[in-house]
Interface confidence: medium
Amino acid sequence: EAQQSEIAHRYNDLGEEHFKGLVLVAFSQYLQQCPFEDHVKLVKEMTEFAKGCAADQSGADCGKSLHTLFGDKLCTVASLREKYGELADCCEKQEPERNECFLTHKDDNPGFPPLVTPDPEVMCTAFQENEQQFLGKYLYEVARRHPYFYAPELLYYTQQYKGVFTECCQAADKAACLTPKTEALREKVLVSSARERFKCASLQKFGDRAFKAWSVARLSQKFPKADFAEVSKLVTDLTKVHKECCHGDLLECADDRADMAKYICENQDSISTKLKECCDKPLLEKSQCLAEVERDELPGDLTPLAADFVEDKEVCKNYQEAKDVFLGTFLYEYSRRHPEYSVSLLLRLAKEYEATLEKCCATADPPSCYGKVFDEFKPLVEEPQNLVKVNCELFEKLGEYGFQNALLVRYTKKLPQVSTPTLVEVSRKLGKVGTKCCTKPETERMSCAEDYLAVVLNRLCVLHEKTPVSDRVTKCCSESLVNRRPCFSALAGDETYVPKEFNAETFTFHADLCTLPDAEKQVKKQSALVELLKHKPKATEEQLKTVMGDFGAFVDKCCAAENKEGCFAEEGPKLVAAAQAALA
């Protein structure tokens, strides 16, 4: 029998449309600087080759691994050395080292301008003239900006994008239809990107065990009626899917994700009562729907946890017989009973339980040693509860922008060495937790907030890893995945920091500020706030309030002036002088 061709297998499983989309995403995530047209050419060649192999699996090169085929194709790009420098060295390596080399050169911060929707008329014309190219360009633009984007999910968002243009390009007021819809989609895409980046970081930095533990907790909360073996099965499959996508194996990843959706839908009875609607949808929507499905109700027959994990005389025997399985059942049982807890908290509790058993099972009287273990959970539970309460109160008092600024001050004082753009980006995202989570009912606040914070702080870790400047960030990012947030929360102001020299250029503004969209205007103001703090880290809240108030008034005044540039040139230095005096 002819050797099974991997590329033919994936082409047949996925179908031509999805195959092409995924190959485009893969190439765009590896070669982020290449123009769209170059990628289209590579995708075309790859698809023709796959088609040939599907027709005749014994054809030349059809038996080669996907990594070999993809790598060979990437290494044919003419401008590799000029455009990518070191990345070209990867081409001198053999698989699997070559693919690993490509992965290490993925750039999390490629510096492309944010994706915006230009003139609706222009967009609609482009969409209607060549739909395939229009959607391909979207795939490419998102993938190159987000080199770890979850590829099958990006196919789903591209389908949504198509739906938006199909609807809005028929509308009388195209802009009124397109703007809110593309903006809402953009937000979803950004959150999706950050979530997957967190998953990839979990796998790459902390290994399968960390990712599996996170998934056991999450799926046990979602599917509390499923038994432990069922949850474990789903976790095993999910780990494989995300490992593949994070490793650049997008065809395998999408194929396995489809298989997983099929399995879930064929076994609804042993998983959840909430899946029927999702399972009636076509593939992309089905997978997305399953990923977002609401949690099932708790079964009525849940016994108190203490019976099995504290009072049972054989706790140490059960633990020592198979530590991972016993701890897995503990995490499963605890998580399904506590949908209101964050996954991060559940993992901290499991860690505490493990540490207690390690210590107690080595003593002469283990039961009396671990008998109070659940009491030791109290402070671990109260810490995030209090954090959410205090910060949501602050958010309600200040609003999103004010809350972002409070976080900006807090984090700049903690981590003054971190670059201003990174501090602004991360603090703005941290501030969005208020809008996203503080409006939710009490029972959903903690899991929403803490798990979102984990994703945002991962962005800080990823950006910092590229150019490390702070030992504190390195320590919080690398010591423990579940304790990242408490680690950052516990940091006080950095007393070792030497204030930055004052640079008037940093505080020089021009008339172009006036034409910026509101969000970008805010970023400019927030960058000034960070720079101010780096210059005067001991500034009080009152002083900062005064200076920022003056700054806001200055911008408003000059943007309303007849001669804007003249106003900025004249009033700017006065503002700087007043600010220096106020902070003296």
Epitope: F228, E230, K233, T236, D308
Partner: nanobody, 119 residues
Framework: EVQLLESGGGLVQPGGSLRLSCAAS????????MLWVRQAPGKGLEWVSV????????YYADSVKGRFTISRDNSKNTLYLQMNSLRAEDTAVYYC????????????WGQGTLVTVSS
């Protein structure tokens, strides 16, 4: 009613191998996770291995990891345990059991089959 019938036990020398089988009836085998448990003379029950209804994932007690392999054939309603590199401490009555709806305990088990490892 649920019936589980184990077979394949016997006397074997240390380092030897045995393959246990468990024929299941009275419930939908292909939607049930299954496990093997054992009881050494004068000792309590110890779980050995678990297998999901689909055949993966599988779990093993630390004491048998790398030596024992659990598998199943859903078309034959049969569960297996391949035991290699047997040791004296593996001597026990081996039972197959139906996995419960929650904890790492078990609902039903069969009559058992005795495995004796001795030179």
């Amino acid at each position: 009613e649920v019936q589980l019938l184990e077979s394949g036990g016997g006397l074997v020398q240390p380092g030897g191998s045995l393959r246990l089988s468990c024929a299941a009836s009275g419930f939908t085998f292909d939607t049930s996770s299954m496990l093997w448990v054992r009881q050494a003379p004068g000792k309590g029950l110890e779980w050995v291995s678990v297998i999901h209804q689909s055949g993966t994932p599988t779990y093993y007690a630390d004491s048998v990891k790398g030596r024992f392999t659990i598998s199943r054939d859903n078309s034959k309603n049969t569960l297996y345990l391949q035991m290699n590199s047997l040791r004296a401490e593996d001597t026990a009555v081996y039972y197959c059991a139906k996995f419960p709806s929650s904890r790492m305990k078990f609902d039903y088990w069969g009559q058992g089959t005795l495995v004796t490892v001795s030179s």
